[in-house]
Amino acid sequence: MAVTACQGLGFVVSLIGIAGIIAATCMDQWSTQDLYNNPVTAVFNYQGLWRSCVRESSGFTECRGYFTLLGLPAMLQAVRALMIVGIVLGAIGLLVSIFALKCIRIGSMEDSAKANMTLTSGIMFIVSGLCAIAGVSVFANMLVTNFWMSTANMYTGMGGMVQTVQTRYTFGAALFVGWVAGGLTLIGGVMMCIACRGLAPEETNYKAVSYHASGHSVAYKPGGFKASTGFGSNTKNKKIYDGGARTEDEVQSYPSKHDYV
C-alpha cells in the first residue's frame, strides 16, 4: 500500500512539475524590466525564450518573436535546448510511468517489469528536473551578468542635456515557475525510484522439498529463473544457483519485506 502511494504521489508530483516546466518554457516573462531606481516609463518590457513583449500603460501589448536562429545568443539557445530536453524526457517519463503504475493492470505484466519501468521513469524525471533547473539557472546567471553590466553604464551618451535610459532586466515569473517545477519533477523522480525498490519482486519462501536419489540428500529450489531487478533480491550478495540443486546443509536466507526499505 505504501509503495502504491509513493508511486502514485511520485507520478502526480512529476506530472505537476512537467506541466510547470512546459508552462515556464512557453511563458513570456523570463526577464522583466527592472522598475527599481528607474525613471517611471509608460511602457513595460519583458522577454521570454521565444519572443519579447512590450506592455504600454494604455493596455496595448505588442509581442515580437525571435525570427532568427543564428542571431540569438548561444546561452539563450542552450537554455531553449535544456528546457526542450527536459520536456521531452518528462513526457516520455510520464508515458512510461503510466504503464508502470501498480494500480493499473495491463495484461499479465510482471511486477519486475513494472519495477523496471518505474525506475526508468524515475530516472527520466530526475534528469528532466535537472535540465529545467539548469536551464533556468543559466538564464538567471545571464540576467545577473547583464544587469550589473547595464548598471555600470546606466546612462549612456551623457554629452550635454540628452540622456538615454538603458533598460535593465530582472528575474521574471517564469524563472520561479521553472525552478519550482524542476524541483517538483526531481522530487517526483526520486519518489518513483524509491517506489521501484518496493515494487521489486520478493523471492517466494518455499520450504525445501527433499528428493532422495542415490543416497544423496538434494533440495530443489524452485523459482530460480525469476528475473532480478537488481533491487532487494540480491542485496545480501548471495550466490544464486539458477535452477540448481542445493544440499539441505546449506543455510538459506531469503530477503524479507523489510530488506527493501
Epitope: 525613471p39 516609463t41 509608460a42 512590450v54 504600454e56 538603458q166
Partner: antibody
C-alpha cells in the same frame, strides 16, 4: 463610432468645487483608461493624469495632486474630474481623452470650459 | 520631467508648400524592447479638441492624410506636411509618450500667408 461627450461649461467662484463628466461610447469602457488634459488660455496642453478604467485607480501628476480627483461610474461609462477649492488659475478648458495604442490620446472629448471668477 | 522643445513656435506658409517642424526631447524616447520611439503628434484647430495625427514617431493614425509624415529617432523628431492645405492651419503639438508624466511641447502654430 467611438465618442467622448463632456458636460457643459462651468462658471464658478474661488473656493467652490466643480465636477466635469466625460461619457464614453462606441467601445468597451473598461478596456481603456481615461486621461485628463488642461489647456489654459494662451498656453499649451498640460497632462493632469489618468484613471485605470477596469480598476478605478487614479494617477495624478505632481502639479495636480491634492485638489484634483478622478472617479468612475462604470455602469454609465462615465469618468469624472472633480476640482475642489477652486482658484482663479484653474480657469481653463479641460479635456478627457481615451488611452490609445502607442500611449496616445486617440479620442478626445469636446472640452469643458471652467471659468473661476469672483 | 521630460522637456519637449518645439521649433519654430509659428510658421507662415502658402497653400501647396512643404512644411517641416521640429521637436526635441530632453531624453531619448526610444524603447529598446520594441525599438519604437514613443513620440506623438497632435493637431489642434481653433475651438476644437486636439486630434491624433502620428504615434510611435512615424505611424499615421487611420484617417490621417498621407501628406503628414513623422520621422526621427531618440531625441530629434520632425513632422512634415508635404503640401499644405487650408484645413491644415492649426497648432501642432508633439508629446512624450514614454516617460511619466506625459509632457507636451509648447506647439507650432501654422498660419496662412
Amino acid at each position: 463610432q467611438i465618442q467622448m461627450v463632456q458636460s457643459g461649461p462651468e462658471l464658478k467662484k474661488p473656493g467652490e468645487t466643480v465636477r466635469i463628466s466625460c461619457k464614453a461610447s462606441g467601445y468597451s469602457f473598461t478596456t481603456a483608461g481615461m486621461q485628463w488634459v488642461r489647456k489654459m488660455p494662451g498656453e499649451g496642453l498640460k497632462w493632469i493624469g489618468w484613471i485605470i478604467a477596469h480598476s478605478g485607480e487614479p494617477k495624478y501628476t505632481e502639479d495636480f495632486k491634492g485638489r484634483f480627483a478622478f472617479s468612475l461610474e462604470t455602469s454609465a461609462s462615465t469618468t469624472y474630474l472633480q476640482i475642489s477649492n477652486l482658484k482663479n488659475e484653474d480657469t481653463a478648458t479641460y479635456f478627457c481623452a481615451r488611452w490609445g495604442k502607442g500611449n496616445t490620446m486617440d479620442y478626445w472629448g469636446q472640452g469643458t470650459s471652467v471659468i473661476v471668477s469672483s | 520631467d521630460i522637456v519637449m522643445t518645439q521649433s519654430p513656435s509659428s510658421l507662415t506658409v502658402t497653400a501647396g508648400e512643404k512644411v517641416t517642424m521640429s521637436c526635441k526631447s530632453s531624453q531619448s524616447l526610444l524603447n529598446g524592447g520594441n525599438q519604437r520611439n514613443y513620440l506623438t503628434w497632435y493637431q489642434q484647430k481653433p475651438g476644437q479638441p486636439p486630434k491624433l495625427l502620428i504615434y510611435w514617431a512615424s505611424t499615421r493614425e487611420s484617417g490621417v492624410p498621407d501628406r503628414f509624415t513623422g520621422s526621427g529617432s531618440g531625441t530629434h523628431f520632425t513632422l512634415t506636411i508635404s503640401s499644405v492645405q487650408a484645413e491644415d492651419l492649426a497648432v501642432y503639438y508633439c508629446q512624450n509618450a514614454y516617460f511619466f508624466p506625459l509632457t507636451f511641447g509648447a506647439g507650432t502654430k501654422l498660419e496662412l500667408k
